[in-house]
């Protein structure tokens, strides 16, 4: 009876459990009935970090000088490269594709703190009665407006992102 | 494509004024915060004050708080930075930055050298 599943770090092909590649190489040829499966390193500037059936190793990353990137951390067979920003910049995502001076805080949010050389910008969520309408990375949470030292009152209530809207008091009609 | 150009920069003595600009273009100037941010020989960048799209609101680092001024004329699509009672610490390469700024689009920057 030909297998239906295969165990950990096994494929199924042509009705039979082969060997997966372990992470650095990649896939020749499938096993036979004869033969065991047939891996080959990657390349300098490849990598494959699982065990796999891949024909192709992946290509690592490059750290663009030109984006403001350099090398973090040199690739391996198993690894990819890992790229950072130049001293004073910020990657802008986790994968760090790109880099920028420091990070804006969106509405909703305001500056903590300044970025500096070391630090990016750090944000925090404005509280109840603060908001900030902006993307910032300087500006801090403002507090709404107080409409009673304006002798008015609050016709549409303050968010995270926007001030309260202040109106004339209803007179009473006699 | 957004350029920055800085401009003004020059030796000054200590004590002495100058007024920086920063000529932008390949962006809508008018909807972005605005920086200006030095690096001195052999040091990091340090930011040294903001302004607000508007031009309502503004930051200033506390090494230059009450001898630096920033301003902006969204007509012009220019960025300022006054200078004054400028002292040997000041002496820096002076960029001009939008929000976000990606570093492919950073500026050539402008000399300010304060020395007697």
């Known amino acids: 009876e030909p297998p239906t599943a295969c165990r950990e770090k096994q494929y199924l092909i042509n009705s039979q459990c082969c060997s997966l590649c372990q992470p650095g190489q990649k896939l020749v040829s499938d096993c036979t009935e004869f033969t065991e499966t047939e891996c080959l390193p990657c390349g300098e500037s490849e990598f494959l970090d699982t065990w796999n059936r891949e024909t192709h190793c992946h290509q690592h990353k490059y750290c663009d000088p030109n984006l403001g990137l350099r090398v973090q951390q040199k690739g391996t067979s198993e690894t990819d490269t890992i790229c950072t920003c130049e001293e004073g910049w910020h990657c802008t995502s986790e994968a760090c594709e790109s880099c920028v001076l420091h990070r804006s805080c969106s509405p909703g949010f305001g500056v903590k703190q300044i970025a500096t050389g070391v630090s990016d910008t750090i944000c925090e969520p404005c509280p109840v009665g603060f908001f900030s309408n902006v993307s910032s990375a300087f500006e801090k949470c403002h507090p709404w407006t107080s409409c009673e030292t304006k002798d008015l009152v609050v016709q549409q209530a303050g968010t995270n992102k926007t001030d309260v809207v202040c109106g004339p008091q209803d007179r009473l009609r006699a | 494509e957004v350029q920055l150009l800085e401009s003004g920069g020059g030796l000054v003595q200590p004590g002495g004024s100058l007024r920086l600009s920063c000529a932008a273009s390949?962006?809508?100037?008018?909807?972005?915060e605005m920086w200006w941010v030095r690096q001195a020989p052999g040091k990091g960048l340090e930011r040294v004050s903001?302004?607000?799209?508007?031009?309502?609101?503004?930051y200033y680092a506390d090494s230059v708080k009450g001898r630096f001024t920033i301003s902006r004329d969204n007509s012009k699509n220019t960025l300022y930075l006054q200078m004054n009672s400028l002292r040997a610490e000041d002496t820096a390469v002076y960029y001009c930055?939008?929000?976000?700024?990606?570093?492919?689009?950073w500026g050539q920057g402008t000399l300010v050298t304060v020395s007697s």
């Open positions: 903001a302004i607000n799209p508007q031009g309502t609101r503004t």
């Open positions: 930055a939008k929000l976000p700024q990606l570093f492919q689009d």
């Open positions: 390949g962006f809508t100037f008018r909807d972005y």
